[in-house]
């Protein structure tokens, strides 16, 4: 489900429960995808040790996932509401090519993959709607991405094993990154 | 066995500069949150700061601009600046196993003390 | 700020018993509460996170609840090694705040 239980409208308008903000609609939809990609990690885990690995021994990779810096106005130093949403969507548009990969790269979890696939672009549509400045917001070109895709799919076994535990572990990493800003929101 | 250990801790008069370290044994920091926590002499636990990546940190209102978090892969320094005798506390590093979205403590440091007095 | 308000600062109670401590946040947390377990001269041990998870070898007899803005720990079937101060931490934004954790309830067991 690209949405937590009891996040659709059906839930939302129940009487018994109050519908929930924009802040906490964003808010517990990334902690369903952390959820999500926790257990992914879970599996990839399971089958190599990469996740044992230091952050400085798989430093050296040619992938160009998002990351959040001090520019992007996201750290409690510097804190930016407007620049650090831009970057937040950003990111996340910008993830969407590597989430296509991730789908599959899993065997017992092929849903849980979907899962995490479907709820980052309702997130994203979630964080549009927050957003004053979308003209900011520059969008992924679709055949850089395709390329992209396609020489990520041609990599050695090891490697793509490699690309999927950096994807899953940077991509942890954006989202809690995101999420402790957007509480400061 | 996973543990951290800080050091550094001192007498040191009013107004000097110290830096504390805590060291990782069993596992690497770079995996890892790392949070500083204090404890003044018969007080309860005051938290200071954090440090979640390389760069990205976050400190409680008190210590803004006095206290400062870096990590490398094997330590994580706390420098601070202007002591007072109301710094006069011992010094606990912890680790957050940085898997979930809360903060949440699970590995001590056993402590060091730092004594601000003239 | 998320301020944690812990009640009460001291309690007492007999080998075998039982007793409450309360914590209290400024705003909603949801289910981001840990609890702490301190004894003298020692390092603060993690026992329960996410309200009422138990960390990893705590007894069962330690039992966390709540969630938004009240939790809730209980000790059970108390014993001679229980006597520690307590603390509660709020994990849900180590932004803007003075303090993360509680003031801390001793507790004494006669």
């Known amino acids: 489900a690209p949405v937590p239980p009891g996040e659709d409208s059906k839930d939302v308008a129940a009487p018994h429960r109050q519908p929930l903000t924009s802040s906490e609609r964003i808010d517990k939809q990334i902690r369903y995808i952390l959820d999500g990609i926790s257990a992914l990690r879970k599996e990839t885990c399971n089958k190599s040790n990469m996740c044992e690995s230091s952050k400085e021994a798989l430093a050296e990779n040619n992938l160009n996932l998002p990351k959040m810096a001090e520019k992007d106005g996201c750290f409690q130093s510097g804190f930016n509401e407007e620049t650090c949403l831009v970057k937040i969507i950003t990111g996340l548009l910008e993830f969407e090519v590597y989430l296509e990969y991730l789908q599959n790269r899993f065997e017992s979890s092929e849903e849980q993959a979907r899962a995490v696939q479907m709820s980052t672009k309702v997130l994203i549509q979630f964080l549009q709607k927050k957003a004053k400045n979308l003209d900011a917001i520059t969008t992924p070109d679709p055949t850089t991405n395709a390329s992209l895709l396609t020489k990520l799919q041609a990599q050695n076994q090891w490697l793509q094993d490699m690309t999927t535990h950096l994807i899953l572990r940077s991509f942890k990493e954006f989202l809690q990154s995101s999420l402790r800003a957007l509480r400061q929101m | 066995c996973q543990s951290l250990e800080e050091s550094g801790g001192r007498l040191v008069t009013p107004g000097t500069p110290l830096t504390l370290t805590c060291t990782a044994s069993g596992f690497s920091l770079s995996n890892y949150y790392v949070t500083w926590v204090r404890q003044a002499p018969g007080k309860g636990l005051e938290w200071i700061g954090i440090?979640?990546?390389?760069?990205e940190t976050a400190y409680a209102t008190w210590a803004i601009g006095r206290f400062t978090i870096s990590k490398t892969s094997t330590t994580v320094d706390l420098k601070m600046t202007s002591l007072t005798a109301a710094d006069t506390a011992t010094y606990f590093c912890a680790r957050d196993d940085s898997s979930d979205w809360d903060a949440k403590f699970n590995l001590w440091g056993q402590g060091t003390l730092v004594t601000v007095s003239s | 700020a998320y301020d944690m308000t812990q009640t009460p600062a001291s309690v007492s109670a007999a080998v075998g018993g039982t007793v409450t401590i309360k914590c209290q946040a400024s705003q909603s947390i949801n289910n981001e509460l840990s609890w702490y377990q301190q004894k003298p001269g020692q390092r603060p041990k993690l026992l329960i996170y996410r309200a009422s998870t138990l960390a990893s070898g705590v007894s069962s007899r330690f039992k966390g609840s709540g969630s938004g803005t009240e939790f809730t720990l209980t000790i059970s079937d108390l014993e001679c090694a229980d006597a520690a101060t307590y603390y509660c931490?709020?994990?849900?934004?180590?932004?803007?705040?003075?303090?993360?954790f509680g003031g801390g309830t001793e507790v004494v067991v006669k």
């Open positions: 440090i979640y990546g390389s760069d």
């Open positions: 931490q709020q994990g849900y934004s180590l932004r803007n705040i003075d303090n993360a």
